[in-house]
């Protein structure tokens, strides 16, 4: 947060530990920038709906780091 | 009953710290943001920052970033804001409030602060 | 950080006249600009968000309009206990930032 260069706000204003990974389509994850300080993770349901996960979510962790390390910015 | 009850009028000497308290009762605490905003006499209105009960996250203004700390107790629905290195610059009301609801779901759309709590006077003096 | 200019500074005016009150800001902030009524001793209260949106339980006298960064807040009819600051808000980026307010007094 800057008081000269301005933050957007992030996409997640609210996230959720209980999704079963089962239900889950496609994740994406979304790195710390311009556009909001912290790591984002839509998770795109099966049925159609995205969701905000929380990135310090265990079964979530592992999967994070390796999209990040791996330079992805979507995945 | 929606409320936000802010902790007692303090007093404090230059170089304090202060600490208020926010205690959201009659709603979902971690469906809303909470935002400090401080209003000295006299003045606008100016936003100190805020903090998601939901992650714990804070988000500061850089004025403060490095005075001042928004914490949350979500055992008790209460959000707490430390203010050190106080100043007599520093005397205001500070005001809690909160922003929302939201949901589980990805939006760029804002709610404004529609809950207020009934603010708390800090008066630095020596 | 972002500008909101509001103006007039002061508007006076008698009960039952229109108010317009305008708040420009110095880059486009999308929707996300909310209106704020304060009157003396008193916690801020919400009265439009999102550019538009009525809040529950304030008076349909109460309307707002305008986009990126242009924004008006209107009062069709003013009632006595309209007379009071008015602050306009921004919370698409941080810094949230409000506007320097504007005073609708008696005429």
């Known amino acids: 947060v800057s008081a000269v260069l301005t933050e957007l706000r992030c996409t997640c204003l609210r996230v959720t530990l209980r999704v079963n990974p089962k239900t889950i389509g496609k994740l994406q994850v979304f790195p710390a920038g311009p556009q909001c300080s912290k790591v984002e993770v839509v998770a795109s349901l099966k049925n159609g709906k995205q969701v905000c996960l929380d990135p310090e979510a265990p079964f979530l962790k592992k999967v994070i780091q390796k999209i990040l390390d791996s330079g992805n910015k979507k995945n | 009953q929606v409320q936000l009850v802010q902790s007692g009028a303090e007093v404090k000497k230059p170089g304090a710290s202060v600490k208020v308290s926010c205690k959201a009762s009659?709603?979902?605490?971690?469906?809303?943001?909470i935002h400090w905003v401080r209003q000295a006499p006299g003045q606008g209105l100016e936003w100190m920052g805020n903090?998601?009960?939901?992650?714990?996250?804070?988000n500061y203004n850089e004025k403060f970033k490095s005075r001042v700390t928004m914490t949350r107790d979500t055992s008790t629905s209460t959000v707490y804001m430390e203010l050190s290195s106080l100043r007599s610059e520093d005397t205001a009301v500070y005001y809690c409030?909160?922003?929302?609801?939201?949901?589980?779901?990805?939006?760029?759309?804002?709610?404004?602060?529609?809950?207020w709590g009934q603010g708390t006077l800090v008066t630095v003096s020596s | 950080e972002i500008v909101l200019t509001q103006s007039p500074a002061t508007l006076s005016l008698s009960p039952g006249e229109r108010a317009t009150l305008s708040c420009r800001a110095s880059?486009?902030?999308?929707?996300?600009l909310h209106w704020y009524q304060q009157k003396p001793g008193q916690a801020p209260r919400l009265l439009i968000y999102?550019?538009?949106r009525s809040v529950s339980g304030i008076p349909a006298r109460f309307s707002g309009s305008g986009s990126g960064t242009d924004f008006t807040l209107t009062i069709s009819s003013l009632e006595p206990e309209d007379f009071a600051v008015y602050y306009c808000?921004?919370?698409?980026?941080?810094?949230?930032?409000f506007g320097g307010g504007t005073k609708v007094e008696i005429k």
């Open positions: 409030a909160r922003e929302g609801p939201y949901s589980y779901y990805p939006s760029r759309q804002y709610y404004g602060s529609d809950l």
């Open positions: 009659g709603y979902e605490f971690t469906s809303y943001w």
């Open positions: 903090i998601s009960p939901n992650s714990g996250s804070a």
């Open positions: 880059q486009s902030i999308s929707n996300n």
């Open positions: 999102y550019t538009s």
């Open positions: 808000g921004q919370n698409n980026e941080w810094p949230e930032v």
